[in-house]
Interface confidence: low
């Protein structure tokens, strides 16, 4: 009797082991993603940003998938969603072709299931950079709180690609989830 | 029977209240420090900011340790890191030994048993903050999912410190874990 | 004595299952509100946004409460607010009132018992919008790890609401419950 | 077209000093970067220093501490003060222009150092 | 800082003939990439600057392409006054760096 009871013991310790287990890795994808610099766009123009690292250096990921320029859900889940988006130039890369520049980003999920785009987050500023200083920087950070179903996609959109600062402190974006969906 | 029964689950039950407790409390590390303005550097160079408070105000600190200006790691896991700086200037303070300003936050990650310093994040903006307006003001926000060893040190740099906004909802950094290292 | 046995190991399973269920679910309430454009304050004074979505689109709010324009913490914890404001202008809408701006966001916490309000995060730039360019645009974003109680209220205060981009990917705040107190 | 002259090679002992000049002419110079690059007998290309049109300087590691580039505007000039001199520094000197790279080189100057 | 990797060394070919030349960067420099000619006893000389744009006055032929890390120096048709050493160079962050040249010689 006593030796059944403690076979049950270990079965509910075990099962539940198990499911603490489980649920507290599987329950938390994240993602870090690095820009990678030697595929960025030139031109000024609105582009989707498709070359990140997700392997090396800062960038890591973990129950999530980065497959053709795209962070993919595979669980769903509340995540926190950021992205941290740097621009620089400097006099001697030559001439901006515009002194008045629009440096933006835009954070968008994307669902296959329903073909459709949206736009999650964006930040970003006008800026005038003028030919009497001979450095220019300017950083965008934007985050929030999203519920994603697997299969939905993440992707960043950045206006000026040729502008980015393809350091890995630098420009860089992320997920991590909080919670499951109830 | 019965009673032996009852035993054996009141020890499943308080063993498991035991490790839910101790895990999540001892899982979820976290700090939130504020800017001791009392010690600010002068001048425009950048600066590691090492006067920090951690339990006054908003800051706060649990399981991780701030000393010698950096906040050292407790415990190994994935932690959210982040940064608010915000520089500030008022005519009324004298004026700038330049109108062009290269306004920027480093967030650094040290290792001791290897000894090397990292930028995890950085973030900012060049300014032109010119004598024709009596106040000026910007801030930067940086934030990220990062993998931490424990004994690890994260520090702030920053550029053109004797600007620094003072107030404790101004300049800020921080961290909390997310989940453990698999 | 083995059904016996088995209706005590459900017990304990079962009030573990609500136990695990029953915490997890309450010990995470979210929200993330995005501006209701509706009605947004004129004047380029500093001001309280009252009017937010919280059930549309991407916003939504689970275990808080939202009223009266503000954020109502339920459950005492460790929380990470983070906001997210937009402000632009475009010629066609007219001249500013100036074209040196201060774009400012500033989150407050509000305690009912002590009638007291707190600042607990700041960010923003000074701007200087000149009539050379047709369009402007500035984001800002702040975020940070706070103890909340029950009862105590968030609120967001911007400057220049006019300027205010009533999309809900651009201005936007939230929070998240990361761990117990203590 | 764009024109740069260069003087003030020579010879130095080392731990000598040496001021090299670059003059620019048929284009506004104040609104250009300038730098110096240099290159030792027989080897590659090496940046030394450069200086922008708001008068920020860089240098390369290698001269750091020794050597300070400046330009005055009023004259069209750029300068480069080196110190410290060492066998190491020997090579032909050149100033360039550096909008969209290095468009325009002076014709060079030698600077030997030797005992 | 980043290195610059030019290949080959020193190559032989005729008049008429096509090269090309390639560099590589240790790390994405997008296309801050510019090319140099230099004869013996002269000064440098810009070809391309910004990976693919050709400098003022320089003849067709001469054409650069690439991005990221890998770039390429192409000279369509080989005329006896290209015979020199050409370098690449990045402008991407600071010290802008060299390549260590190719040497093309006549064949």
């Known amino acids: 009797g006593s030796q059944h009871i403690r076979a049950e013991k270990a079965m509910v310790d075990g099962s539940w082991l198990d499911l603490a287990k489980r649920s507290k890795l599987e329950a938390q994808p994240f993602a870090h993603l690095t820009i990678n610099a030697t595929d960025i766009p030139s031109g000024s123009h609105k582009v989707s940003l498709s070359s990140w690292y997700h392997d090396r250096g800062w960038a890591k990921i973990s129950n999530m998938t980065f497959s053709n320029g795209k962070l993919i859900v595979n669980q769903d889940g509340f995540y926190y969603l950021y992205a941290n988006i740097c621009f620089r130039h400097h006099e001697t890369s030559g001439d901006l072709a515009t002194e008045y520049l629009q440096l933006m980003v835009y954070v968008t999920k994307t669902s296959i299931k329903i073909p459709s785009s949206h736009t999650l987050m964006k930040g970003g500023s006008t800026k005038y950079w003028s030919g009497n200083s001979e450095f220019h920087f300017y950083s965008i950070n934007v985050g929030g709180f999203f519920k994603l179903r697997s299969g939905e996609e993440i992707s960043i959109e950045v206006s000026n690609p040729s502008l980015l600062d393809p350091d890995q402190d630098a420009t860089y974006f992320g997920a991590f989830k909080v919670r499951d969906i109830d | 029977g019965s009673q032996h029964i009852r035993a054996e689950k009141a020890m499943v039950d308080g063993s498991w209240l035991d490790l839910a407790k101790r895990s999540k409390l001892e899982a979820q590390p976290f700090a939130h420090l504020t800017i001791n303005a009392t010690d600010i550097p002068s001048g425009s160079h950048k600066v590691s900011l090492s006067s920090w408070y951690h339990d006054r105000g908003w800051a706060k600190i649990s399981n991780m340790t701030f000393s010698n200006g950096k906040l050292i790691v407790n415990q190994d896991g994935f932690y959210y890191l982040y940064a608010n700086i915000c520089f500030r200037h008022h005519e009324t303070s004298g004026d700038l030994a330049t109108e062009y300003l290269q306004l920027m936050v480093y967030v650094t990650k040290t290792s001791i048993k290897i000894p090397s310093s990292h930028t995890l994040m950085k973030g900012g903006s060049t300014k032109y903050w010119s004598g024709n307006s009596e106040f000026h003001f910007y801030s930067i926000n940086v934030g990220g999912f990062f993998k931490l060893r424990s004994g690890e040190e994260i520090s702030i740099e920053v550029s053109n410190p004797s600007l620094l906004d003072p107030d404790q909802d101004a300049t800020y950094f921080g961290a909390f874990k997310v989940r453990d290292i698999d | 004595g083995s059904q016996h046995i088995r209706a005590e190991k459900a017990m304990v399973d079962g009030s573990w299952l609500d136990l695990a269920k029953r915490s997890k679910l309450e010990a995470q309430p979210f929200a993330h509100l995005t501006i209701n454009a509706t009605d947004i304050p004129s004047g380029s004074h500093k001001v309280s946004l009252s009017s937010w979505y919280h059930d549309r689109g991407w916003a939504k709010i689970s275990n808080m409460t939202f009223s009266n324009g503000k954020l109502i913490v339920n459950q005492d914890g460790f929380y990470y607010l983070y906001a997210n404001i937009c402000f632009r202008h475009h010629e066609t809408s007219g001249d500013l009132a100036t074209e040196y701006l201060q774009l400012m966001v500033y989150v407050t916490k509000t305690s009912i018992k002590i009638p007291s309000s707190h600042t607990l995060m700041k960010g923003g730039s000074t701007k200087y919008w000149s009539g050379n360019s047709e369009f402007h645009f500035y984001s800002i974003n702040v975020g940070g790890f706070f103890k909340l109680r029950s009862g105590e209220e968030i609120s967001i205060e911007v400057s220049n609401p006019s300027l205010l981009d009533p999309d809900q990917d651009a201005t936007y705040f939230g929070a998240f419950k990361v761990r117990d107190i203590d | 077209e764009v024109q740069l002259v260069q003087s003030g090679g020579g010879l130095v002992h080392p731990g000598g000093s040496l001021r090299l000049s670059c003059v620019g002419s048929r284009f506004t110079f104040s609104a250009y970067p300038m730098h110096w690059v240099r290159q030792a007998p027989g080897k590659g290309l090496e940046w030394v220093s450069g200086?922008?049109?708001?008068?920020?300087?860089n240098y390369a590691d290698s001269v750091k501490g020794r050597f300070t580039i400046s330009r005055d505007t009023a004259k069209n000039s750029l300068y480069l003060q080196m110190n410290s001199l060492r066998a190491e520094d020997m090579a032909v000197y050149y100033c360039a222009r550096g909008r969209n790279s290095f468009d325009y080189w002076g014709q060079g100057t030698l600077v030997t150092v030797s005992s | 800082d980043i290195q610059m990797t030019q290949s080959p060394s020193s190559l032989s070919a005729s008049v008429g003939d096509r090269v090309t030349i390639t560099c590589r960067a240790s790390?994405?420099?997008?296309?801050?990439l510019a090319w140099y000619q230099q004869k013996p006893e002269k000064a440098p000389k810009s070809l391309i600057y910004?990976?693919?744009s050709l400098q003022s006055g320089v003849p067709s032929r001469f054409s650069g392409s690439g991005s990221g890390t890998d770039f390429t120096l192409t000279i369509s048709s080989l005329q006896p006054e290209d015979f020199a050493t050409y370098y690449c160079q990045q402008y991407n962050s600071y010290p802008p760096t060299f390549g260590q040249g190719t040497k093309v010689e006549i064949k």
């Open positions: 790390q994405g420099i997008s296309t801050w």
């Open positions: 200086i922008g049109s708001g008068g920020g300087t």
């Open positions: 910004a990976a693919s």
